[in-house]
């Protein structure tokens, strides 16, 4: 995902509803005018804004990188909602990029979890059953197996 | 003359309360939001709260229970209430009109604030 | 809320040096960044807005550059009464962020 940047606002174009502030505050899908006494709305698909707020300006919509679809578009009031392609996952540690699922556990253990935009297939260690945690295995260790298969 | 005066400040014993006031003078402060700031003896600018326009007020976390910022439109002027005061709110105190995208653009000459016993 | 940091904390400097001072938000806020200069017993002064637009009657000699996370004050030819400290401030989001200082760059004579 492209980070999150902010956009300033240009002088509200003729077609940018307005309206005034209450409490101080302007809300979701609106920022604060440079004099404080307008609410000026954000601009459809290309910055948001989530709650309310006296920002001088929107945020800027995220971009789905290649490598990730879009699960649904930004609005004045929500982000980019962007996933990782099948096959990819995100890890929380390294939320920049979306990297390669292995495609089996090690010897000597046994898929538990599948791949998810989220999340690394899961191998535990067949007789403990605990979790293994680290880098993929190289080639010649892995067993693979097809999906809803156990690997032997 | 456009210009802030704060008055108010003095000695005061931990645990007691103040009122400062602030008195604007060439514009009306009820068109502005307005804030608080204090200045510790030899250390930096601290940001204490505001007020806006519409009265609504905000304020950093440091003074959210303790500290109140009101508004007399009839008089001009701007309050800080501070209650339950300790000796780590020893500072100056300012005044200032904040104009949001350009910054606190007038600020008062401030006035000092001692808590000991 | 936004916390700003101001680096250095001190420089000395002589009368015609360029001095440059940083500030960095912890998020951005676009150039609503405003610099102050103080001098002992009184308030601070406003330089400069929207980070690089300057202050009214301030010398052309101050310039503030930067937007999203990274501002700079520079005075290109010090002068003996720039010897001060210089604060930075968030502009936007003030009820929604706070808006702290920066810590302060003290300017002191070489």
């Known amino acids: 995902i492209t980070q999150q940047d902010l956009a300033p606002q240009q002088r509200a174009a003729p077609q940018q509803k307005r309206s005034s502030p209450s409490e101080g505050l302007c809300p979701p899908g609106h920022h604060i005018s440079e004099d404080g006494r307008d609410c000026i709305s954000c601009k459809y698909g290309q910055d948001y804004s989530t709650h309310w707020n006296d920002l001088l300006f929107c945020l800027r919509c995220t971009r789905c990188d290649s490598g990730e679809v879009e699960l649904s578009p930004c609005t004045t009031t929500r982000n980019t909602v962007c996933q990782c392609e099948e096959g990819t996952f995100r890890e929380e540690d390294s939320p920049e990029m979306c990297r390669k699922c292995r495609t089996g556990c090690p010897r000597g253990m046994v898929k538990v979890g599948d791949c998810t935009p989220w999340s690394d297939i899961e191998c535990v260690h067949k007789e403990s059953g605990t979790k293994h945690s680290g880098e993929a295995p190289a080639v010649e260790e892995t067993v693979t197996s097809s999906p809803g298969t156990p690997a032997s | 003359e456009v210009q802030l005066v704060e008055t108010g400040g003095g000695l005061i014993q931990p645990g007691g309360s103040l009122r400062l006031s602030c008195a604007a003078s060439g514009f009306t402060v009820s068109r502005y939001a307005m804030i608080w700031v204090r200045q510790a003896p030899g250390k930096g600018l601290e940001y204490i709260g505001f007020i806006t326009s519409d009265g609504s007020t905000y304020y950093a976390d440091s003074a959210k229970g303790r500290f109140t910022i009101s508004r007399d439109n009839s008089k001009n002027t701007l309050y800080l209430q501070m209650n339950s005061l300790r000796a780590e709110d020893t500072a100056v105190y300012y005044c200032?009109?904040?104009?949001?995208?350009?910054?606190?653009?007038?600020w008062g000459r401030g006035t000092l604030v001692t808590v000991s016993s | 809320d936004i916390q700003m940091t101001q680096s250095p904390s001190s420089l000395s400097a002589s009368v015609g040096d360029r001095v440059t001072i940083t500030c960095r938000a912890s998020q951005s806020i676009s150039t609503y960044l405003s610099w102050y200069q103080q001098k002992p017993g009184q308030p601070p002064k406003r330089l400069i807005y929207k980070a690089s637009t300057l202050a009214s009657g301030v010398p052309s000699r101050f310039s503030g550059s930067g937007s999203g996370t990274d501002f700079t004050l520079t005075i290109s030819s010090l002068q003996p009464e720039d010897f001060a400290t210089y604060y930075c401030?968030?502009?936007?989001?003030?009820?929604?962020?706070?808006?702290?200082f920066g810590g302060g760059t003290k300017v002191e004579i070489k």
């Open positions: 200032a009109r904040y104009t949001y995208s350009d910054g606190t653009d007038l």
């Open positions: 401030q968030p502009n936007s989001g003030i009820a929604t962020y706070g808006a702290a």
